[in-house]
Interface confidence: low
């Protein structure tokens, strides 16, 4: 006997209780492929989530995060609180980057400044909480006429002794 369920299009399900009739998905559910025996419950974008695309009978809802949050995970499965540039998110909320680290985004963690000397270069622009240092040419690259130029001192914050 031919399986009549294979004829059921997306947006319907094969209702075994009704002689394999293709029944439309109930409200707040969907089937994205044909031949389904059940419809999936639509995702609910609530709380920190807001609806980017409404659920339809053939496709799931898609969520974004409300203002002040950003998406994490596949299909925005989580929302994480935004921080300011120069901060990172910890268990206790947004905290300023420690001296010697920076974060130039509203998300993610503070990362160490680039160590210019590892590449044989000098610090051209000091780092801040929000910005990495800018490395300049190595002293050997400087022309004799420019060799008297003093590279900027490493960035230092109040309360920190030079490292």
């Amino acid at each position: 006997l031919q399986d009549l369920c294979s004829n059921c299009p997306a947006g319907t399900f094969c209702d075994n209780n009704r002689s394999q009739i293709c029944s439309p998905c109930p409200p707040n559910s969907f089937s994205s492929a044909g031949g389904q025996r059940t419809c999936d419950i639509c995702r609910q974008c609530k709380g920190v989530f807001k609806t980017r695309k409404e659920c339809s009978s053939t496709s799931n809802a898609e969520c974004d995060c409300i203002s002040g949050y950003h998406c994490l995970g596949a299909e925005c499965s989580m929302c994480e609180q935004d921080c300011k540039q120069g901060q990172e998110l910890t268990k206790k909320g947004c905290k300023d980057c420690c001296f010697g680290t920076f974060n130039d985004q509203k998300r993610g963690i503070c990362r160490p400044w680039t160590n210019c000397s590892l590449d044989g270069k000098s610090v051209l622009v000091n780092g801040t909480k929000e910005r990495d240092v800018v490395c300049g040419p190595s002293p050997a690259d400087l022309s004799p006429g420019a060799s008297s130029a003093t590279p900027p001192a490493p960035a230092r914050e109040p309360g920190h002794s030079p490292q």
């Epitope: 409200p27 707040n28 639509c42 609910q44 974008c45 609530k46 709380g47 920190v48 989530f49 807001k50 609806t51 409404e54 809802a61 995060c65 409300i66 203002s67 002040g68 949050y69 994490l72 989580m78 929302c79 994480e80 609180q81 935004d82 998110l89 910890t90 268990k91 206790k92 909320g93």
Partner: antibody, heavy 130, light 111 residues
């Protein structure tokens, strides 16, 4: 005792702004979302918006977008609702109401308000009249 | 976002049961199990009596019960008492990350 204490009566002229405060006590202020709801004389309840006192993020009813600003001061456990460009139809009692849900998780961000308003302030009567 | 639809008034005699309906759409009442009911007496702030469609907060009489079918939620008050006379409001979460209230229902206890 868990309670929300709002400012008293406010009388404003059309075009002005009003800032209503709501001081929370008896619970951890940053652990519960706060809603603002208003009620015009003889009329029903109208949801205005919600603020997460932990991060300060907000979501406003479309009707009030651009006119309402919800803020909070965690040091005093106080939520604020400011409504600008007042008109006579803004005459109403303005309530702050705590959301029943608890337990914001910074790592997942998956804290969702329940939408049940379990603790209400007594309301601030705002009259807009020329 | 339109207000949820409630009857303007209902009435009943002491001891009777009454039901107040709250009709929305698939974007609010029909789409979520986040329907709440509030009792408001004159000059007072609203009081939560039902949330999550059927759940009663502690301290609320078991004479109050909630249910939902499709896009309509209902509040039933059994064994009606004079003190139940008040305005009743439903509210629901919506797919726009907002909440919406019903227009309110005035309950009159006869006799």
């Amino acid at each position: 005792e868990v309670q929300l204490v709002e400012t008293g009566v406010e009388v404003k002229k059309p075009g002005a702004s009003v800032k209503v405060s709501c001081k929370a006590s008896g619970y951890t202020f940053t652990s519960y979302y706060m809603h603002w709801v208003r009620q015009a004389p003889g009329q029903g309840l109208e949801w205005m918006g919600i603020i997460n006192p932990s991060g300060g993020s907000t979501s406003y009813a479309q009707k009030f977008q651009g006119r309402v600003t919800m803020t909070r001061d965690t040091s005093t456990s106080t939520a604020y609702m400011e409504l600008s460009s007042l008109r006579s139809e803004d005459t109403a009692v303005y309530y702050c109401a705590r959301d029943l849900g608890e337990g914001y998780d910074f790592w997942s961000g998956y804290y969702t308000p329940s939408g049940a308003f379990d603790i209400w302030g007594k309301g601030t009567m705002v009259t807009v009249s020329s | 976002q339109s207000a949820l639809t409630q009857p303007a008034s209902v009435s009943g005699s002491p001891g009777q049961s009454i039901t107040i309906s709250c009709t929305g759409t698939s974007s609010d009442v029909g789409g979520y199990n986040y329907v709440s009911w509030y009792q408001q007496r004159p000059g007072k702030a609203p009081k939560l009596i039902i949330y999550d469609v059927t759940t009663r907060p502690s301290g609320v009489s078991n004479r109050f019960s909630g249910s939902k079918s499709g896009t309509t939620a209902s509040l039933t008050i059994s064994g009606l008492q004079a003190e139940d006379e008040a305005d009743y409001y439903c509210s629901s979460y919506t797919s726009y990350s907002t909440w919406v209230f019903g227009g309110g229902t005035k309950l009159t206890v006869l006799g």
